[in-house]
Interface confidence: low
């Protein structure tokens, strides 16, 4: 891989539409890992610190940005949907963690490394109270 | 899967104000139904994948569409894919 | 935009207590999470205490028993009151707030107390 083509993902989590949660009682957080190169990446969701499964929806495989471009940077989507009491309740703590196999942008390169490092870029919410 | 009552809805959601990206969501429609890759190449558009609560013996559809152009909106992010007009939900402006 | 100021740091000998504000201004009706964290030259940042705007209180092991996290929502302040101070307590406290999305994830420009006899 060409180092100077790597590019840590940014990861940010949009939360539920009060729309979706008073049509349907349900809330659907939204993950989304953009313009990481090359596109090894593990997205995972994070409840009051656990790692949670039910619920969740990743996509299959990193979307190319620029589909064009041969070396094109990737995207990554993932849902986690929460019933709305759930969400609604403002101790709870929801993480989107995307591990990323490659170098931090402030990392150094040295000689003697020889596997990439692991980083960890992370997005949170809080269960959402009323205003 | 099968789905049991489809209830096919686009949900724009809400980032931090310091993000610039829009995120629509197309969720809880039938199994039937493909979505579309947009012809903008500055709207992003993921294939559908299936979700499952299982606490809540509920599955559903899903796919998702996000863009950093400022004149993006959820009415047009699946203008390719066809949905009913009454899918769409507004967004009201949080009163917080 | 929030914007947290800390306060209350200090010189204090082993055995003594100073008490840390922080003060909250801007979307605070946004935030539902308060956390101190500290950083000691040379060492990397690590929790003190949280407390939620449900008022639970979470502590890291070296601060249960003598330190003490609080706030008082009508001042928009949370407290950290630290007794039985220790020369291992010497680092920069920086204040932390989390609103209800990320990355409204919020940091003061810390206050720096020092246990020295």
């Known amino acids: 891989e060409d180092l100077k083509k790597v590019f840590p993902p940014k990861v940010a989590v949009f939360e539920p539409s009060e729309a979706e949660i008073s049509h349907t009682q349900k809330a659907t957080l939204v993950c989304l890992a953009t313009g990481f190169y090359p596109d090894h990446v593990e997205l995972s969701w994070w409840v009051n610190g656990k790692e949670v499964h039910s619920g969740v929806s990743t996509d299959p495989q990193p979307l190319k940005e620029q589909p064009a471009l041969e070396d094109s940077r990737y995207s990554l989507s993932s849902r986690l949907r929460v019933s709305a009491t759930f969400w609604h309740n403002p101790r709870n703590h929801f993480r989107c963690q995307v591990q990323f196999y490659g170098l931090s942008e402030d990392d150094e390169w040295t000689e003697d490394r020889d596997k990439p490092i692991t980083q960890k870029i992370s997005a949170e919410a809080w269960g959402r109270a009323d205003c | 899967p099968y789905i049991q009552n489809p209830d096919p809805a686009v949900y724009q959601l809400r980032g931090s104000k310091s993000n610039d990206t829009s995120v629509c969501l197309f969720t809880d429609f039938d199994s039937v139904m493909n979505v579309s890759q947009s012809k903008d190449s500055d709207v992003h558009i993921t294939d559908k994948t299936v979700l499952d609560m299982r606490s809540m013996d509920f599955k559903s559809n899903g796919a998702v569409a996000w863009s950093n152009k400022s004149d993006f909106a959820c009415t047009s992010a699946f203008k390719d894919s066809v949905i009913p007009a009454d899918t769409f939900f507004p967004s009201p402006e949080s009163s917080c | 935009d929030v914007q947290l100021v800390e306060s209350g740091g200090g010189v204090v000998q082993p055995g003594g207590s100073l008490r840390l504000s922080c003060v909250a201004s801007?979307?605070?009706?946004?935030?539902?999470?308060y956390g101190w964290y500290r950083q000691a030259p040379g060492k990397e940042r690590e929790k003190v205490a949280h407390?939620?705007?449900?008022?639970?209180?979470d502590y890291a092991d070296s601060a249960k028993g003598r330190f003490t996290i609080s706030r008082d929502e009508s001042k928009n302040t949370v407290y950290l009151q630290m007794n039985s101070l220790r020369p291992e307590d010497t680092a920069t406290y920086y204040c932390?707030?989390?609103?209800?999305?990320?990355?409204?994830?919020?940091w003061g420009q810390g206050t720096l107390v020092t246990v020295s006899s």
């Open positions: 932390r707030a989390l609103s209800r999305i990320w990355p409204y994830d919020y």
């Open positions: 801007g979307y605070v009706h946004k935030i539902n999470f």
């Open positions: 407390i939620s705007i449900g008022d639970q209180t």
